[in-house]
């Protein structure tokens, strides 16, 4: 028998520097977590230990923090190589900053080598990229050789800016005939190493034939045999086991996100390449584990420039920008639009001529908007301004949910109205009536959504049967401020790029904003 | 030092089989893969395959799949290579060499060769 | 498969001179190329791995460059002794390994 150890994460987005606990920036360091001075020590330590160890990461490395914002993916690939990551899988934020954006800070100069077996350049991408991702990549370990096949979510195109010229494939089956010529070379263990979530990662272990094990990116899964260390609920076993068609049991892990979990993975094979037994946890990078001390000098090198960056000016406002709790848990206040309107621009993705976007809807909770900004300083809009109103490093996602569901959440809105409160929507692509004189649960009259399957956009009725596109923060994704409904009914949630940057690229963009309050949100006569 | 001992030429018949071996000395023979390379008269190189000693595990260049056999006999840290089915086209030196890697990023390079046989195939 | 092409079969130079031996990979290879030396009746000797990195024992006066698809070997003040023939091998492939056809240094 043959042992093999899979370090693996997934989902890291930007987290270089230790965390709190919940994935925000530290605050108390004796009670930090993660990082990549941290996880290089455990990793090392793991090295040192074992004999045939692999590190690998699933994607999404890019987006999260300011780190992101500076560096662009440069500081992807300076940590990574620095990690001696030995393969990872491209994830759909990896394509935020357009194909441009992956190529050159990344591709060029990871010393890894970064899969996707169903991403397929055409046109004059195709010889540029030519050989800078592979479909897979073959690695001796130890007295035996390793496949490891990439996938990445056939989504990106509606998550993130590939362009027109990536074509993305079913992960099936693009990942079969990889897998049957890594098996012509002999190769009889192969792991599949993808971005895709946990559905799309079973399936894959399920459907395609040849693959030993699953390490998968995308839906944040937490997995966890026994008692959990933190806060994290196991969504099942780790590792979770799936019978393939052909009868094998195929373990498949992912490490929940944000590098505060290494996964840790022992599989023993058999001499034909079959899997014998695998068995292990996700270490919790907690601070019993110490700071590498030369990977963290690097980072403090690294971090004079991000401190320089949240002072420059991005754009300016002539118009006070209303974040005050006084408005923005009562009323539409021009703060909240200003929010709603860069979640849309960020998510314009124009890949179907019969829409003008996939999406034209946005909400927020008033309570995720802790800062007004004043125009009167030369109307010059920071970083840190930002950072002021988004304190809370969330991201916007991309759900899918029933207008039935969008009903129950305006009416959650107001049914406690008054009491500043942070659950007050703020809008963008729709239009609320609210009657407050009537009782709670009943007091959405007019529910009007902006169309996307059109060339000139329009309100219309909500539709309580029709499925909706919505872009929101994180926080009211996961049921935040009592949006239990959002959490429980949405139909498909995939996570976005981080609040402070979907807003500051739209200020860079714009470089004057006057946003104002416009008749979004309105109360039925006489009863306000 | 490092030494890989190849056995000496062969005349062999159209149709033959014959057995190449390799004596490695000077090191861990368990502990690094052997690769077998071809070089026809005057022609460039050839990767064949490799083996590794300890696992027995092998890969082989597609083009080569039925014509070499590559095993290892760890008690006398030597290896062989059946060639099977013998044209003119076989006709060439055979080189097997040693094969390191690590470091970082992987680097992977033949670092150690046999002095070559030289196999023949003639009526 | 990848495919190493050595344009020139043939490079003349003279001794004391510098010569650039080209080796084009037909997609990214990364930096995953070595270079061989093929003397006359002996077998292959390591040059250079990771494209740049000179093997134990390899003078300074053999440079390797290069990235993605284009690489390099470079011979400073030729010496009689560097008559040869030089192969590039890529083994971004890895397990598949793929030489170039080689070019064979001549020395007026």
């Known amino acids: 028998a043959w042992e093999l150890t899979i370090l693996h994460t997934n989902d890291v987005h930007s987290r270089l520097e230790q965390t709190s606990e919940d994935s925000s920036k530290c605050v108390n360091a004796s009670r930090c977590m993660g990082g990549v001075a941290r996880l290089f020590t455990k990793v090392q330590q793991i090295r040192r230990a074992e004999p045939n160890v692999l590190l690998l990461d699933a994607g999404d490395q890019y987006q999260g923090t300011i780190w992101f914002t500076v560096y662009k993916g440069a500081e992807v690939a300076h940590f990574m190589n620095a990690l001696r990551y030995d393969a990872m899988a491209l994830g759909n934020h990896e394509f935020d900053n357009g194909v441009e954006g992956l190529i050159e800070p990344l591709l060029k100069e990871a010393k890894f080598p970064i899969l996707s077996a169903n991403i397929k350049a055409k046109g004059p991408l195709a010889s540029q990229i030519s050989g800078l991702y592979l479909p897979y990549k073959v690695l001796p370990v130890g007295d035996e050789v390793v496949g490891i096949v990439g996938y990445t979510s056939k989504e990106t195109p509606f998550l993130s800016n590939p362009g027109t010229n990536l074509v993305f494939e079913d992960e099936i089956t693009a990942l079969q005939p990889e897998v049957d010529k890594l098996k012509t070379l002999n190769v009889n263990k192969i792991i599949a190493l993808g971005h895709s979530g946990f559905e799309m990662d079973k399936l894959i272990a399920q459907k395609v034939r040849g693959v030993d094990v699953v390490v998968g990116g995308h839906s944040n899964t937490f997995l966890y045999t026994g008692n959990p260390p933190s806060k994290e609920v196991p969504a099942g076993k780790y590792p979770f086991i799936v019978t393939s068609d052909d009868g094998r049991k195929v373990p498949v892990v992912q490490a929940y996100a944000f590098g505060k979990y290494l996964g840790y993975l022992k599989i023993e094979f058999d001499e034909r390449g079959n899997v014998i037994s695998s068995h292990g946890n996700p270490i919790l990078l907690n601070s019993s584990i110490p700071e590498d001390p030369s990977i963290k000098a690097d980072i403090n090198k690294w971090r004079i420039k991000l401190d320089n960056y949240s002072t420059q000016e991005l754009g300016k406002t002539i118009v006070y920008l209303d974040g005050s709790s006084q408005s923005c848990r009562f009323r539409e206040c021009n703060m909240g639009n200003l929010i709603c309107d860069a979640m849309i621009n960020n998510n314009l993705r124009h890949t179907d001529e019969m829409f003008w976007n996939h999406v034209s809807m946005c909400i927020l909770n008033g309570g995720g908007i802790r800062s007004p900004i004043d125009e009167r300083n030369n109307g010059t809009i920071t970083w840190e301004n930002l950072a002021a109103v988004l304190p809370f490093g969330g991201t916007f996602d991309l759900v899918q949910l029933k207008g039935s569901t969008l009903k129950k959440a305006f009416e959650h809105s107001v049914h406690r109205y008054g009491q500043s409160t942070g659950e007050f929507l703020q809008v963008g692509g729709i239009h609320v009536v609210y009657d407050l004189s009537r009782k709670p649960g009943d007091r959405v009259v007019k529910l009007d959504v902006l169309c996307t399957k059109c060339r000139v956009p329009s309100y219309d009725p909500l539709k309580m049967d029709e499925v909706y596109k919505v872009i929101l923060p994180n926080f009211l994704a996961n049921g935040g401020d009592g949006f239990q409904m959002i959490k429980d009914e949405l139909l498909r949630h995939d996570s976005g790029d981080q609040d402070i940057n979907v807003v500051s690229t739209y200020i860079s963009k714009m470089k004057v904003i006057y946003p104002a309050v416009e008749g979004r949100i309105k109360f039925s006569t006489g009863s306000h | 030092q490092v030494q890989l001992q190849q056995s000496g030429a062969g005349l062999v018949k159209p149709g033959a089989s014959v057995k190449l071996s390799c004596k490695a000395s000077?090191?861990?023979?368990?502990?690094?893969?052997m690769h077998w390379v071809k070089q026809r008269p005057g022609q460039g190189l050839e990767w064949i395959g490799m083996?590794?000693?300890?696992?027995?595990?092998?890969n082989n260049n597609e083009k080569f799949k039925n014509k070499a056999t590559l095993t290892v006999d760890k008690s006398s840290n030597t290896a062989y290579m059946q060639l099977s089915s013998l044209t003119s086209e076989d006709s060439a030196v055979y080189y097997c060499?040693?094969?390191?890697?690590?470091?970082?990023?992987?680097?992977?390079?033949?670092?150690?060769w046999g002095q070559g046989t030289s196999v023949t195939v003639s009526s | 498969d990848i495919v190493m092409t050595q344009s020139q079969k043939f490079m003349s130079t003279t001794v004391g001179d510098r010569v650039s031996i080209t080796c084009k990979a037909s997609?990214?290879?990364?930096?995953?190329v070595a270079w061989y030396q093929q003397k006359p009746g002996q077998s292959p000797k390591l040059l250079i791995y990771?494209?740049?990195d000179r093997y134990t024992g390899v003078p300074d006066r053999l440079t390797g460059s290069g990235s993605g698809t284009d690489f390099t070997l470079t011979i400073s003040n030729v010496q009689s002794e560097d008559l040869a023939d030089y192969f590039c091998?890529?083994?971004?492939?890895?397990?598949?390994?793929?030489f170039g056809s080689g070019t064979k240094l001549v020395i007026q």
């Open positions: 060499a040693r094969f390191f890697f690590g470091g970082y990023p992987h680097y992977y390079a033949l670092d150690y």
């Open positions: 000077g090191y861990t023979f368990t502990n690094y893969w």
């Open positions: 083996i590794h000693p300890n696992s027995g595990s092998t």
């Open positions: 997609q990214n290879v990364g930096t995953a």
């Open positions: 990771s494209a740049s």
């Open positions: 091998q890529q083994y971004s492939s890895f397990p598949l390994f793929t």
